[in-house]
């Protein structure tokens, strides 16, 4: 599923991401834009044999199990396929674990490079939330 901007903002708010660990909703929408272009089925294979999955491009080396990444830690204890669902529950729950790890949203390079320090509230402007 490819979410609309406001549609995703509403879904993320419903799942408790607004101000989760101090990050406003706009940060999460911005991260999703630059990680996956709001596409829940986005996948990207990496040079180390791992793959990034879903709307927040969560990596199989550390966070989920796809059965083909040697030494996967599966810290979110989920199959990576769950991160491709049009229901973003699994991605949000895993994202909450990631952002709680100590480095906050810096864990998303796209957020660090494209969203951090910008007017992230623009990503939810005009949305009925």
């Amino acid at each position: 599923k490819v979410f609309g901007r406001c549609e995703l903002a509403a879904a993320m708010k419903r799942h408790g991401l607004d101000n989760y660990r101090g990050y406003s909703l706009g940060n999460w929408v911005c991260a999703a834009k630059f990680e996956s272009n709001f596409n829940t089925q986005a996948t990207n294979r990496n040079t180390d044999g791992s793959t990034d999955y879903g709307i927040l491009q969560i990596n199989s080396r550390w966070w989920c199990n796809d059965g083909r990444t040697p030494g996967s830690r599966n810290l979110c204890n989920i199959p990576c396929s769950a991160l491709l669902s049009s229901d973003i529950t699994a991605s949000v729950n895993c994202a909450k674990k990631i952002v709680s790890d100590g480095n906050g949203m810096n864990a998303w390079v796209a957020w660090r490079n494209r969203c951090k320090g910008t007017d992230v509230q623009a990503w939810i402007r005009g949305c009925r939330l």
């Epitope: 990207n44 100590g102 390079v109 796209a110």
Partner: nanobody
Framework: DVQLQASGGGSVQAGGSLRLSCAAS????????MGWFRQAPGKEREGVAA????????YYADSVKGRFTISQDNAKNTVYLLMNSLEPEDTAIYYC??????????????????????????WGQGTQVTVSS
């Protein structure tokens, strides 16, 4: 508390070899990246080599490609830097560093090399390498 312990420096003739070691302790998970940097007198700190600790992908500065090899022992959270064909220009204090961010998406640890260590949040004490001609 996170600590990095570097060892293995010394003096060597040009053309010789040295192996540096860096042991990381205090991590519950990670580190994600480990790397080696160096600083010669009067010069900026520069990246030498880095490795993704999960996948083992390696990155090198152009000046050391083909001569230096970075490797890992994941069980010991230790990285090594094997330096062959050393040149007087390799003389510097060598520092190991770690990026403890466990990235959500895949991150190439080599990015920090060209920026003097951007993203690397833990640094070990230096070990002196002196190469004489």
């Amino acid at each position: 508390d996170v600590q990095l312990q570097a060892s293995g420096g010394g003096s060597v003739q040009a053309g010789g070899s040295l192996r540096l070691s860096c042991a990381a302790s205090g991590y519950t998970i990670g580190p994600y990246c480990m790397g080696w940097f160096r600083q010669a007198p009067g010069k900026e700190r520069e990246g030498v080599a880095a490795i993704n600790m999960g996948g083992g992908i390696t990155y090198y500065a152009d000046s050391v490609k083909g001569r230096f090899t970075i490797s890992q022992d994941n069980a010991k959270n230790t990285v090594y830097l094997l330096m062959n064909s050393l040149e007087p220009e390799d003389t510097a204090i060598y520092y190991c560093a770690a990026d403890s961010t466990i990235y959500a998406s895949y991150y190439e640890c080599g990015h920090g090399l060209s920026t003097g260590g951007y993203g690397y949040d833990s640094w070990g004490q230096g070990t002196q390498v002196t190469v004489s001609s």
